[in-house]
Amino acid sequence: MMTGTIETTGNISAEKGGSIILQCHLSSTTAQVTQVNWEQQDQLLAICNADLGWHISPSFKDRVAPGPGLGLTLQSLTVNDTGEYFCIYHTYPDGTYTGRIFLEVLESSVAEHGARFQIP
């Protein structure tokens, strides 16, 4: 039975040209995290595998930095980066946990962080 929950940074906003940290955290389970995949709609951003290290998709290589931890730093933001991002935790023996983050990239300088929330 899957008992864990994914806590994410929730709905967040950031300024065009700036950077943002996409972060998820798996709690309430003793399952071992073997890999975390980061995706945006139908595109893979990055993979962090416990044994194999990081894979960064070529389309994001210039502006994605691994970390901190299992998170992802997205740099040089454009309005096209607005949308849903998913952290997919592959664990043993539980299976897969998915967290969702919505990022809005703003033209103005009024970018505020949304509240943290949990996805069971």
Partner: antibody
Framework: EVQLQQSGPELVKPGASLKISCKTS????????MHWVKQSHGKSLEWIGG????NGGTKFKGKATLTVDKSSSTAYMELRSLTSEDSAVYYC????????????WGQGTSVTVSS | DIVMTQSHKFMSTSVGDRVSITCKAS??????VVWYQQKPGQSPKLLIY??SYRYTGVDRFTGSGSGTDFTFTISSVQAEDLAVYYC?????????FGGGTKLEIK
Amino acid sequence: EVQLQQSGPELVKPGASLKISCKTSGYTFTEYTMHWVKQSHGKSLEWIGGINPNNGGTKFKGKATLTVDKSSSTAYMELRSLTSEDSAVYYCARSGNWDYAMDYWGQGTSVTVSS
Amino acid sequence: DIVMTQSHKFMSTSVGDRVSITCKASQHVSTAVVWYQQKPGQSPKLLIYSASYRYTGVDRFTGSGSGTDFTFTISSVQAEDLAVYYCQQHYITPWTFGGGTKLEIK
């Protein structure tokens, strides 16, 4: 020039163990993950596992044990309790910096398990 | 484990033709797909990575797809393209390969 030079062909008896080497040159060994891939005669490819030299240590993947020697930029795969099912060509291959695609491959080591 | 299915074990084509090889994943693999070419008696060679990115010096080859369905295309087949072509996913370990498609030149 990047090179992955594997050890020569092997003929071993069932139940025996075997260690295959993959000596690398032309790049910084610790910056790339090393993988091992099996190809049985006339068959497809099967990924055995990979080892990140930076993390060092030993990786156990079924009957295979993957190790690295950073001082000689060499990767090793030991196969235990060999059976005829293990007769195959084994390749080492590296995956790139921040990329999982295996961009350079060794020439392969042919292993025959027969009594 | 994710199963990568290449429905055609063999494909026959002529020099100059355009040919497409398909690969279907048993579950979502996003764009974490690679294509390799293996000529008789040789090691596999990387052609396409991250589903659609050409590796150095492989101009006639293109890849496309996302999710579960992927296609590898040779725009104008040459005699030296006689080989087996494999798709492989690295979305999740264990990484898995398709069964291969052998390209035969008429």
